[in-house]
């Protein structure tokens, strides 16, 4: 019962985590304009992995996709790759774990097969969560570096009367969503791996048991008790690695000029 609960909870936690990773990857607020120097800006800038947006006080938001692939920073490409790998692994992990759930019976699938599948999905969730955490952390590090670089630039070259305020970016909501989601996927994966241990069938073999009716001596040879934990030689661990590509079009969503009531 505890095993089923652990497996089920692991699946649900991973599902929430992967949904969060997908949400974070799609979100536009990976970096948002730092308002420390100009808290009263009438124009607010924010950027995602796929496009950058500008929100005006008027209510209009303009988003432009990053149409170039080669012109983008290598770090951004790396973050995109990590997030996509995380999503793909997580999605495959979810698919595998559905069939591995103890509460779902598919034909005459043995418990050992379910244990293997649970372990496989668990490992996938762990790797998926780590990919998301790594991706978000790489982006956060990039932001911190750029933040301090732009801060240094803000106080140089201001000899003239005219001031040019450089836009600085700070952590966006997507980073926190990504960190939490990655953590949940990781926890879910660990729970699946723990559940795998309890799922493996206990093989009890009674070898060479002989009864001699004629004699007084009874020879009893207990066979080797073997419990499959799922981590033994009978378990085949399969790591699946896949990548994905995605293109994003320019989006400009405005309410119409004549918005009749």
């Amino acid at each position: 019962m505890a095993v089923t609960a652990c497996q089920g909870l692991g699946f649900v936690v991973s599902l929430i985590g992967i949904a969060g990773i997908i949400a974070a990857t799609c979100m536009d607020q990976w970096s948002t304009q730092d308002l420390y120097n100009n808290p009263v800006t009438a124009v607010f800038n924010y950027q995602g992995l796929w496009r950058s947006c500008v929100r005006e006080s008027s209510g209009f938001t303009e988003c432009r996709g990053y149409f170039t692939l080669l012109g983008l920073p290598a770090m951004l490409q790396a973050v995109r790759a990590l997030m996509i790998v995380g999503i793909v692994l997580g999605a495959i992990g979810l698919l595998v774990s559905i069939f591995a759930l103890k509460c779902i019976r598919i034909g005459s699938m043995e418990d050992s097969a379910k244990a293997n599948m649970t372990l496989t999905s668990g490992i996938m969730f762990i790797v998926s969560g780590l990919c998301a955490i790594a991706g978000v952390s790489v982006f956060a590090n990039m932001l911190v570096t750029n933040f301090w670089m732009s801060t240094a630039n803000m106080y140089t070259g201001m000899g003239g009367m005219v001031q040019t305020v450089q836009t600085r970016y700070t952590f966006g909501a997507a980073l926190f969503v990504g960190w939490v989601a990655g953590g949940l996927t990781l926890i879910g994966g660990v729970m699946m791996c723990i559940a795998c241990r309890g799922l493996a069938p206990e093989e009890t073999n009674y070898k060479a048991v002989s009864y001699h009716a004629s004699g007084h001596s009874v020879a009893y040879k207990p066979g080797g008790f073997k419990a499959s934990t799922g981590f033994g030689s009978n378990t085949k661990n399969k790591k699946i690695y896949d990548g994905g590509a995605r293109t994003e079009d320019e989006v400009q969503s405005y309410p119409s000029k004549h918005d009749y009531v």
Epitope: A42, V43, N45, V54, E56, S58, G59, K257, D259
Partner: antibody, heavy 118, light 113 residues
Framework: EVQLVESGGDLVQPGGSLKLSCAAS????????MSWVRQTPDKRLEWVST????????YYSDSVKGRFSISRDNARNTLYLQMSSLKSEDTAMYYC???????????WGQGTAVTVSS | DIVMTQSPSSLTVTAGEKVTMSCKSS????????????LTWYQQKPGQPPKLLIY???TRESGVPDRFTGSGSGTHFTLTISSVQAEDLAVYYC?????????FGAGTKLELK
């Protein structure tokens, strides 16, 4: 057709209060940022206040901060400017305007006159 | 606060003439996020509210004649009327729409010779 009609302007004594209204028609007020701008007797334009779309953030010029309050009633499709502790320098023609691309005001009302005098 | 300085304060022209007026800001109005300048030009005729002419420094509002052209970037902006008509006689204001307070210039009055 988009229309903005201001009302509530009057002759008021220094230290008095006044509430200006701006009735909007032809568009949904809540979907747009709105501003109040005044024109002083010497014909200078002065931005007074802005309420952004959704009405979460409000902004005021330093000269009216703490004395004026911008608000809107989405059900009535009306924008308001509550003015208190009025000074003689608040004497002006008050216009309300709808914010468009680039935070520019694409539609203006005809204005309502506020005179602060003893 | 961003200070907007308009010049000249008044212009006396003849119909058909090309007119150029200037607007300078104390801070850059260029937004790095979309590479747009948040400067607006308005036209105000006597007894009327101001009318939007140009936004984003160079984008003409619908219905505005194409003889009106906005240009410039950062801190220096220009409004050009290629061939002045009698109906163009008005006061022209520039406005900072980038940072609060959304300051206006003192205006340039266009008069007929």
């Amino acid at each position: 057709e988009v229309q903005l009609v201001e009302s509530g302007g009057d002759l008021v004594q220094p230290g008095g209060s006044l509430k200006l209204s701006c009735a909007a028609s032809g568009f949904t007020l809540s979907r747009y940022g709105m501003s109040w701008v005044r024109q002083t007797p010497d014909k200078r334009l002065e931005w007074v206040s802005t309420i952004i779309s959704g009405g979460i953030n409000t902004y005021y010029s330093d000269s009216v901060k703490g004395r004026f309050s911008i608000s809107r009633d989405n059900a009535r499709n009306t924008l308001y400017l509550q003015m208190s502790s009025l000074k003689s320098e608040d004497t002006a023609m008050y216009y309300c305007g709808r914010l468009y691309y680039g935070n520019a005001m694409d539609y203006w009302g005809q204005g309502t006159a506020v005179t602060v005098s003893s | 606060d961003i200070v907007m300085t308009q010049s000249p304060s008044s212009l006396t022209v003849t119909a058909g003439e090309k007119v150029t007026m200037s607007c300078k800001s104390s801070q850059s109005l260029l937004n790095s996020g979309n590479q747009k300048n948040y400067l607006t030009w308005y036209q105000q005729k006597p007894g009327q509210p101001p009318k939007l002419l140009i936004y984003w420094a160079s984008t003409r509002e619908s219905g505005v004649p194409d003889r009106f052209t906005g240009s410039g970037s950062g801190t220096h902006f220009t409004l050009t009327i290629s061939s002045v008509q009698a109906e163009d006689l008005a006061v022209y204001y520039c406005q900072n729409d980038y940072s609060y307070p959304l300051t206006f210039g003192a205006g340039t009055k266009l008069e007929l010779k």
